[in-house]
């Protein structure tokens, strides 16, 4: 019951988080005009990952897309990439986790398969959350750097007769949405990973009975099909996570994920 609740909660938290990451990515207010210690202008500037906008006091708002790809700063491109990777991983994670939910029955899917899918989606959510947090943090760092550079310009560039209003940008709402959303996705992912441990089938107390056939030595364990799937107890007397090292007959017996390109 606790496992189902943890898995369900993890799914919901991740869902909210990914929705937040999508919202943050689409938002125009990644950076907003700094109003502190600046002349009060009748124009308010703000910028997003995809376009920059100007809102006049009269209410008129005009947004212009960044139609160039090569002319944009590398950092902005990197942030875009991180956010998109985060969204894609999160979306795949959500899809996987829907089928992994213990409360949803799909055919005769074993708990072990669900456990694996839960772990997979959990890892995807964690990486998705980290991508969003990284993207937002990179952008925030870029803003801080530019803010202090423009502040320096503001006080050094006033030697002439004509003063220019230096528009400085500070953190926009999208940054906070992104941080919170990334954090939620991360938490959801962790919860899914925790739920995976509870979903994994317990080791039985029965001793495995070994039947020695004339050919290969194969151990049969109670549990039917589970023994031959990748999700059950390991049939060979070696660690599951062996770093990819396999015996010759094992490579022949079990198709590897690398066999299909």
């Amino acid at each position: 019951m606790a496992v189902t609740a943890c898995q369900g909660l993890g799914f919901v938290v991740s869902l909210i988080g990914i929705a937040g990451i999508i919202a943050a990515t689409c938002m125009d207010q990644w950076s907003t005009q700094d109003l502190y210690n600046n002349p009060v202008t009748a124009v308010f500037n703000y910028q997003g990952l995809w376009r920059s906008c100007v809102r006049e006091s009269s209410g008129f708002t005009e947004c212009r897309g960044y139609f160039t790809l090569l002319g944009l700063p590398a950092m902005l491109q990197a942030v875009r990439a991180l956010m998109i990777v985060g969204i894609v991983l999160g979306a795949i994670g959500l899809l996987v986790s829907i089928f992994a939910l213990k409360c949803i029955r799909i055919g005769s899917m074993e708990d072990s398969a669900k456990a694996n899918m839960t772990l997979t989606s959990g890892i995807m959510f964690i990486v998705s959350g980290l991508c969003a947090i990284a993207g937002v943090s990179v952008f925030a760092n870029m803003l801080v750097t530019n803010f202090w550079m423009s502040t320096a310009n503001m006080y050094t560039g006033m030697g002439g007769m004509v003063q220019t209003v230096q528009t400085r940008y500070t953190f926009g709402a999208a940054l906070f949405v992104g941080w919170v959303a990334g954090g939620l996705t991360l938490i959801g992912g962790v919860m899914m990973c925790i739920a995976c441990r509870g979903l994994a089938p317990e080791e039985t107390n029965y001793k495995a009975v070994s039947y020695h056939a004339s050919g290969h030595s194969v151990a049969y364990k109670p549990g039917g099909f589970k023994a031959s799937t990748g999700f059950g107890s390991n049939t060979k007397n070696k660690k599951i996570y062996d770093g990819g090292a396999r015996t010759e007959d094992e490579v022949q017996s079990y198709p590897s994920k690398h066999d299909y390109v």
Partner: antibody
Framework: QVQLVESGGGVVQPGRSLRLSCAVS????????VHWVRQAPGKGLEWVGV???????NYESALMSRFTISKDNSKNTVYLQMNSLRAEDTAMYYC????????????WGQGTLVTVSS | EIVMTQSPPTLSLSPGERVTLSCKSS????????????LTWYQQKPGQAPRLLIY???TRESSIPARFSGSGSGTDFTLTISSLQPEDFAVYYC?????????FGGGTKLELK
């Protein structure tokens, strides 16, 4: 048809108060701002202040302490409250609609004359 | 606050002539966000309220004849009337619509020579 009509002007003694009204028709004050501009006899235009659609106001720095702009959206009317009037406040007072582009004024009222004299 | 300086204060001209009015601001009126200059030009005839001619320094208001054009950027702006018509003799004002307070220039009076 957008129309702005100012009223409330007249002769007032120095130190007294006066409230000017700008009745707006054809548009909603919830969507547009209104500027107040004055013009002393034979002089140029002087911006007094503005009340934006959201209700926030901005003023000419020298007038901020004495003048207050407010509005009543239900009556579609903007007010200019002038306190501690001085002789130099004698002018024709205009209200103008804040145009959607460039924060400029595209429609103006005919003006109301305020004379501060003892 | 921004000081708007218009020159010359008065111009005596004849109909059909080309005229250029100057307006200078003490601070740049160029907004980096949209690369637009927040300067407006108005025309005022005696006994009348001002009339909007040009906003964003160069965008002509819909009802304004094509002979009126605005140009300039940053701190230096001009209003050009390509061929003066009798109805164009009036006072022209420029206004800063960027930084509060939204100050006006002193005006340039166009009078008939």
């Amino acid at each position: 048809q957008v129309q702005l009509v100012e009223s409330g002007g007249g002769v007032v003694q120095p130190g007294r108060s006066l409230r000017l009204s700008c009745a707006v028709s054809g548009i909603s004050l919830t969507r547009y701002g209104v500027h107040w501009v004055r013009q002393a006899p034979g002089k140029g235009l002087e911006w007094v202040g503005v009340i934006w659609a959201g209700g926030n106001t901005n003023y000419e720095s020298a007038l901020m302490s004495r003048f207050t702009i407010s509005k009543d959206n239900s009556k579609n009317t903007v007010y200019l409250q002038m306190n501690s009037l001085r002789a130099e406040d004698t002018a024709m007072y205009y209200c103008g609609r804040a145009y959607g582009k460039g924060n400029s004024m595209d429609y103006w009222g005919q003006g109301t004359l305020v004379t501060v004299s003892s | 606050e921004i000081v708007m300086t218009q020159s010359p204060p008065t111009l005596s001209l004849s109909p059909g002539e080309r005229v250029t009015l100057s307006c200078k601001s003490s601070q740049s009126l160029l907004n980096s966000g949209n690369q637009k200059n927040y300067l407006t030009w108005y025309q005022q005839k005696p006994g009348q309220a001002p009339r909007l001619l040009i906003y964003w320094a160069s965008t002509r208001e819909s009802s304004i004849p094509a002979r009126f054009s605005g140009s300039g950027s940053g701190t230096d702006f001009t209003l050009t009337i390509s061929s003066l018509q009798p109805e164009d003799f009036a006072v022209y004002y420029c206004q800063n619509n960027y930084i509060y307070p939204l100050t006006f220039g002193g005006g340039t009076k166009l009078e008939l020579k």
